[in-house]
Each structure stands twice: as structure tokens, then as C-alpha cells.
């Protein structure tokens, strides 16, 4: 859960498990399963299988989320699980559509106040640590549906009610229309569509492409911000280096982002964030001597 993320000492500079945006198609191999005299065949995919105890995890997360967020107390977690399950169970896992997730999306409808949406790209853990502190700002994973699925993998198989715990399609090696990728594309699109006011995005200044057109942010969210509702996008470029004082807002990929956003009639601002690890370390250990004295 988010508390576990906050408890982690280290800040990891990576995208996280749910950004699958290259579109390669392939076919997995078949392996026999079942112990009867007639072998049953299960597709062998290139990706890791469904996270163990997936149904229990989703249900438990739903219960915890609705306890902590009073505005979602009306949500029936059993119905949420049924809708989640219905999106991928008995379906060929390379042929999942956004339509499959609509019943779940409907149940998980939630609004973020204007100016309080935080998008992120390739810097998931720090974005989550930040929204733990700044409680009234929200990443997708602070919303019910994102919270349920964060860091999980799932898939089923055609014509059986079973969950596949052995393997699931890899978006690069197998197919892009798999249950996990389609889920994140669906909820990311919706999250961006409903944003209003000034929207913030946290970007990883340690990457060669600070803004990457192939990330979920670059390929889905940027294009689904609504100019009639969103006045501006403010990018926070997070510096990783201790002595890094460069102005990364001048980076060519940031200029590219500015161009895309400006063409969509949304204003663009950029801010360098130096030493965010310092702030978050002091959240974690307020008595640390470096937090009580000068730099």
C-alpha cells in the first residue's frame, strides 16, 4: 500500500510496473496443464504470471481504501472485485479492450479537486512519497482504481474461469492489448480527462529522456488533458545529483513537451526541484541533525 511506499527509505528512480506502451504483437507457446488423461493446454506467455493472492489483495486494498477515504465509503468492494474480474476472466489476454474495464471504471468514479492532480513519469516512488505528505494532491495510484492495481499483474485465459498464475503477456514480447496495459491506459486516460486547473507532473531529471513520448504520460495523459478545463501544466523536473545545479527546464525533451502542450492551448511552466531527497529524508527522520541545522 501507499504506507509501505512511504516507509521505504530509499527513493527509487524508475517508472514502475505499469507503463507498457510499445506495441509489439507475438504469440506465446502452449504448455500442457491439468492432471487428467486428456491434457489441457495453457498459453505460455513471456511475462510473469498473476500476482499471488491477487483476488484477496484487490479486495483487501479496496476495504482499506474505503475505510481511509470517507467519500468512497459507499463503494461495495465485492462489486468492485466482480467488475475487475469481469474485465479479464475468460477472455483471450491479448484481446482486452478499454470497453472491458468500463463497469469497473464506473464503480470507481472519483473526482480530484482542481489544481490537485499530480501526474508522473519514471519517478513513481518519489511522486507517491510526495502525495503522502501533501495529502490533498493525488496521483493516479492515490485514487481507488490505481491503488487497487498498483504493482500488480493479472491475466486470465480464453474460455476458462481460471486466473493464470504461471505467465501473462509481456507488452513488448507478446502483445500490447493485455489486461494490465489496457487497464493502465484506460484509467490514465480517464484521470487526465477529469483533471482541471493547474496540473502538475513530476519528471525524472536523471533520465536521458526527461520527457518521453512513449511513456504513459507522454502517449496517453498529455493528449487527454482538456484545454477547456486545464489552465496550465507545471512540470517539476526532479534532480537526482547532490551537486546538480543545472537548469533542466532547458532540456530539449522539456522544450518538446512545452511545444505539445502549447499547441493544445494549455500554458506550460517548468520548475527545477533540487534535493527532494533532503526534504523527504527529513519527513522520515525529523530529528536528523542535517534537518535541524544548515546544509
Amino acid at each position: 500500500g501507499l504506507n509501505d511506499i512511504f516507509e521505504a527509505q530509499k527513493i527509487e528512480w524508475h517508472e514502475g510496473s505499469h507503463h507498457h506502451h510499445h506495441h509489439h504483437h507475438g504469440s506465446g507457446s502452449l504448455v500442457p496443464r491439468g492432471s487428467g488423461s486428456l491434457p489441457r493446454w495453457r498459453q505460455q506467455w513471456s511475462g510473469s504470471g498473476t500476482t499471488s493472492r491477487f483476488p484477496e489483495t484487490v479486495l483487501a486494498r479496496c476495504v482499506k481504501y474505503t475505510e481511509v477515504h470517507p467519500e468512497m465509503r459507499h463503494v461495495d468492494c465485492q462489486s468492485v472485485w466482480d467488475a475487475f474480474k469481469g474485465a479479464f476472466i475468460s477472455k483471450y489476454p491479448c484481446n482486452i479492450t478499454e470497453e472491458d474495464y468500463q463497469p469497473l471504471v464506473k464503480l470507481g468514479t472519483q473526482t480530484v479537486p482542481c489544481n490537485k492532480t499530480l501526474l508522473w513519469s519514471r519517478i513513481k516512488d518519489l511522486a507517491h512519497q510526495f502525495t503522502q505528505v501533501q495529502r490533498d494532491m493525488f496521483t493516479l495510484e492515490d485514487m481507488l482504481l490505481g491503488y487497487l492495481a498498483d504493482d500488480l499483474t493479472w491475466c486470465g485465459e480464453f474460455n476458462t474461469f481460471e486466473i493464470n498464475y504461471q505467465s501473462c503477456p509481456d507488452w513488448r514480447k507478446d502483445c500490447s492489448n493485455n489486461p494490465v496495459s489496457v487497464f493502465w491506459k484506460t484509467v490514465s486516460r480517464r484521470f487526465a480527462e477529469t483533471a482541471c486547473g493547474v496540473v502538475h507532473v513530476m519528471l525524472n531529471g536523471s533520465r536521458s529522456k526527461i520527457f518521453d513520448k512513449n511513456s504513459t504520460f507522454g502517449s496517453v495523459e498529455v493528449h487527454n488533458l482538456q484545454p477547456e478545463k486545464v489552465q496550465a501544466l507545471e512540470a517539476w523536473v526532479i534532480h537526482g545529483g547532490r551537486e546538480d545545479s543545472r537548469d533542466l527546464c532547458q532540456d530539449p525533451t522539456i522544450k518538446e513537451l512545452e511545444s505539445i502542450i502549447s499547441k493544445r492551448n494549455i500554458r506550460f511552466f517548468c520548475k527545477n526541484i533540487y534535493r527532494p531527497d533532503k526534504f523527504l529524508q527529513c519527513v522520515k527522520n525529523p530529528e536528523d541533525s542535517s534537518c535541524l541545522s544548515g546544509i
Epitope: 501507499l2 504506507n3 512511504f6 481511509v68 510526495f130 503522502q132 505528505v133 501533501q134 495529502r135 490533498d136 494532491m137 517539476w236 520548475k271 526541484i273 533540487y274 534535493r275 527532494p276 533532503k278 526534504f279 529524508q281 527529513c282 519527513v283 522520515k284 525529523p286 542535517s290 534537518c291 535541524l292 541545522s293 544548515g294 546544509i295
Partner: antibody
Framework: QVQLVQSGAEVKKPGSSVKVSCKAS????????ISWVRQAPGKRLEWMGW????????TYVQKFQGRVTITADESTSTAYMELSSLRSEDTAVYYC??????????????????WGQGTLVTVSS | EIVLTQSPATLSASPGERATLSCRAS??????LAWYQQKPGQAPRLLIQ???TRATGIPARFSGSGSGTEFTLTISSLQSEDFAVYYC?????????FGGGTKVDIK
């Protein structure tokens, strides 16, 4: 040790604005958040909002939304609280305080330590 | 908004006595509560955080306990410098809110 020193007392007319400053010393300004809390005569302490200077993000309590603006100047390690459209009920001592985080059950807890010495704002015609 | 109710409003006691102050929350706030001391003309000072953890430099005679909706601040043996107003504050839910205070005065 972190010390917060606030600007002096102010007397203001109803309808006007007041801007109180809070200068931090002895600590790393970008490594913490600053909150503003007020205490009106005979009333309980009231949290108004906060700022996280390194990100520039603010939170305002709904009661003060639209009337309060909290800002910070990293170069001088100073936080500011401006309250507009003043009325007599805004007569109070205004405190700034560093936010100290604790281990919460879901979110990190927000405590106040240390506090500035307070600034008395009197609103009177 | 979570409402914190402190009792008694005033507690009259003598130096050396034990003082027990109560803070009740309008809904469960787990252990997300702090206690502050305020003397006349001064800013509040953090005494206890996370329900029972003493802040840096706070004497051992101050202790906090409780979780859910019922919390207690105990001063085991009152010293002359302990006569002041005490406030509780919750951090479970935004907005952060304070209790109305308990004044501890000399009997």
C-alpha cells in the same frame, strides 16, 4: 536548532489585508514545511494552511480559502501569510510553525515544532 | 472535520500532585494525536506526538496514552513550571484540528 522569528504586531482596518512574515534560521529551509495557526481571543487554536517551500505547494483550510495566501522565499528562508478582506473576527495572534512529521496510520502525522513567537493582528475601524 | 473535546476545562491542583487531562475525538483517529503546552504570552510547545512519544527535551513526568477516540495526558508530579494551558491536536484527518484546551492552575 530551527528558530522562527515573526514580524511585529499590526493594526488593520476592516476590508484591508495583512501580510505576516516568518524568518527561519538555524535550519535547512528546503527540508521542511511551514504551517500557519491562529489563536483568536477565547477561541481554540486554528490551523490555516501550509507551504512546502521546495515544491511551492500550498494547502489552505476551506474556511480561509480565497482569503489566505501562503508563500515562501527560499533565498531568504522566509515564509509569508497574507490574509485579505479582514474583519473584526480575524483579530488574533498568528503563529508560524515548522511541520514535524510523525508515523501515522496511513499518512505521516503533522505536528508543529517549533513555533514562531506570534504576531498580534488587530482589526478595528 | 474532527472535533476534539478536552476535559476538564480547568484543573486545579497543587505542586507534587498527579494531573490527568482528557481529550476525546468525535471519531476514531488511531494514535494520531499530539499534546502542546502554552504559557501566557508564549507560543505553544510540543510535548507529546503520536499519542505517547515525548518530544525532544520534554521531561519524563509528562506521558501520553490512548488510541481511537480517548486520549490522556498525565503529569506524574506537577512542578511550578507546569501550570499552563494544554491543547491536544489530531493529525488523522485534514483539516488538522485542536481541542479547546485544559487550564491547569494552582489550587
Amino acid at each position: 536548532q530551527v528558530q522562527l522569528v515573526q514580524s511585529g504586531a499590526e493594526v488593520k482596518k476592516p476590508g484591508s489585508s495583512v501580510k505576516v512574515s516568518c524568518k527561519a534560521s538555524g535550519g535547512n529551509f528546503i527540508s521542511y514545511s511551514i504551517s500557519w495557526v491562529r489563536q483568536a481571543p477565547g477561541k481554540r487554536l486554528e490551523w490555516m494552511g501550509w507551504i512546502i517551500p521546495i515544491f511551492g505547494t500550498t494547502t489552505y483550510v476551506q474556511k480561509f480559502q480565497g482569503r489566505v495566501t501562503i508563500t515562501a522565499d527560499e533565498s531568504t528562508s522566509t515564509a509569508y501569510m497574507e490574509l485579505s478582506s479582514l474583519r473584526s473576527e480575524d483579530t488574533a495572534v498568528y503563529y508560524c510553525a515548522r511541520v514535524k512529521y510523525g508515523s501515522g496510520s496511513y499518512y505521516p502525522n503533522n505536528w508543529f515544532d517549533p513555533w514562531g513567537q506570534g504576531t498580534l493582528v488587530t482589526v478595528s475601524s | 472535520e474532527i472535533v476534539l473535546t478536552q476535559s476538564p476545562a480547568t484543573l486545579s491542583a497543587s505542586p507534587g500532585e498527579r494531573a490527568t487531562l482528557s481529550c476525546r475525538a468525535s471519531q476514531s483517529i488511531s494514535s494520531n494525536l499530539a499534546w502542546y503546552q502554552q504559557k501566557p504570552g508564549q507560543a505553544p510547545r510540543l510535548l507529546i506526538q503520536d499519542s505517547s512519544t515525548r518530544a525532544t527535551g520534554i521531561p519524563a513526568r509528562f506521558s501520553g496514552s490512548g488510541s481511537g477516540t480517548e486520549f490522556t495526558l498525565t503529569i506524574s508530579s506537577l512542578q511550578s513550571e507546569d501550570f499552563a494551558v494544554y491543547y491536544c491536536q489530531q493529525s488523522d484527518n485534514w483539516p488538522l484540528t485542536f481541542g479547546g484546551g485544559t487550564k491547569v492552575d494552582i489550587k
